[in-house]
């Protein structure tokens, strides 16, 4: 009774198409698969950034797989062939592992990389990224930003840099068509006559870094003798109403501070007839229905009412 064996996949490699971290892992079928013509061979692929504690694992029938990687670090991957139990009259058979690695040969010391990279997608319309120059780099150092997301043929360079003392410290991006809800990759590299500059790689999804405008048109309406309805409008721009959460801060007679988080453009406040002054501010953020994360807007302008009788009228300023 001969033991069934299978070879590992051939020509296993990691291919960098120049998309700043979006890599292709590809391989060819193992040698000597003739005995298993009726069988669908599967592959178990494991990969990770070097230094990571855990492997990501994929089981696939394909001969390729694509994913995003942190090119600040190296990448290691391994793959083996799986013969399902249906092919072997019993238990699953696995080949030995085929292994490969990939890294971008680093230039310059780590301190020359940009620091404190931050990107904000203002009002779901305008992307702006900013950074600080690396430690100890000279003023002749210039940084360049490149970006790519699925839909672009190749990585593009920033064309509108923000400068300080002649150095690029940020990028204002052009209109980015069909660019949200997908991984957006960035590389900031640099050049200096003095010394080589280390590149930095980043990724994000645009909808997760949105900072909306603050809400507008804050109003008060007396609902009953002890209730006032606070209302506001969604900020101008492309973000639909269903995508907002709001935080309200209310001050009553300079003493009571109420804070609340709500999903609609209204909040009903219990008051007493003695209330002399009411002020509130609101800010907005993209909610969990439209993103995994988001940045609070600035606070709206403060809306206040001072006067004798809150019960008499709708208060609109």
């Amino acid at each position: 009774d001969t033991e069934i064996k299978v070879n590992p996949p051939q020509d296993f490699e990691i291919v960098d198409p120049g998309y700043l971290g979006y890599l292709y892992l590809q391989w060819q079928p193992p040698l000597s698969l003739d005995h298993f013509k009726e069988c669908t061979v599967e592959y178990e692929l494991k990969y990770r950034n070097i230094g990571s504690e855990t492997w990501k694992t994929i089981i696939t029938k394909n001969l390729h797989y694509k994913d995003g990687f942190d090119l600040n670090k190296g990448i290691e991957a391994k793959i083996h062939t799986l013969l399902p139990w249906q092919c072997t009259n019993g238990s699953e058979v696995q080949s030995s592992w085929a292994e490969t690695t990939y890294w971008i040969s680093p230039q310059g010391i780590p301190e020359t990389k940009v620091q404190d990279m931050d990107c904000v997608y203002y009002n779901w319309q305008y992307l702006l990224c900013s950074w600080k120059p690396g430690i100890g780099v000279l003023l002749d150092t210039n940084y360049n930003l490149f970006y790519w997301y699925e839909g672009l043929d190749h990585a593009l360079q920033c064309v509108d840099y923000i400068k300080a003392d002649g150095q690029n410290i940020g990028c204002r991006f052009p209109y980015l068509e069909a660019s949200d809800y997908k991984d957006f990759y960035i590389c900031v590299n640099g050049s200096s006559e003095n010394k080589p500059i280390r590149s930095s790689y980043f990724t994000f999804q645009l909808q997760n870094i949105v900072k909306p405008l603050p809400p507008v048109y804050l109003t008060f309406t007396r609902e009953s003798s002890c209730e006032i309805k606070l209302k506001w409008s969604i900020p101008l721009g492309p973000i639909p109403a269903r995508c907002f959460d709001y935080e309200i801060e209310i001050r009553e007679d300079d003493t009571t501070l109420v804070t609340a988080t709500v999903e609609n453009e209204t909040y009903t406040l219990k008051t007493t007839n003695e209330t002399r002054q009411l002020c509130f501010v609101v800010r907005s953020k993209v909610n969990i229905y439209c993103s995994d994360d988001g940045i609070w807007s600035e606070w709206s302008d403060k809306q206040c009412w001072e006067g004798e009788d809150l019960s008499k009228k709708t208060l609109l300023r």
Epitope: S52, F204, D293
Partner: nanobody
Framework: QVQLVESGGGLVQPGGSLTLSCAAS????????MGWFRQDPGKQREGVAA???????IYADSVKGRFTIYQDNAKNTLDLQMNSLKPEDTAMYYC????????????????????WGQGTQVTVSS
Amino acid sequence: QVQLVESGGGLVQPGGSLTLSCAASGYRISLYKMGWFRQDPGKQREGVAAVDRNGRTIYADSVKGRFTIYQDNAKNTLDLQMNSLKPEDTAMYYCAADLWRIGSPASLSPTDYGDWGQGTQVTVSS
């Protein structure tokens, strides 16, 4: 160069408290998500608590109500206040940061973090 250095571990009795601190250098912690993880010898590293750049926090069910994660932006440290400690909290505790993904939500998955400290040992025993 990014560096994360944990401190504050030690031996504590059940029911006691400890505060772990993670000092970050080479970047501003307020811009990125960070987390605390722990690992027993021979076991998988598990998420304990994490915070994103907007200050939102998440906790493992086993530590909810007992542990608190907070960032001290002035000192550039990430702290973990641990109260009502139990013997099962004994482990090596690691601080981690994700400097690659900008604006991603807090996560307790080790695969979401690329930079790690060396760890500090916490032992809960009478």
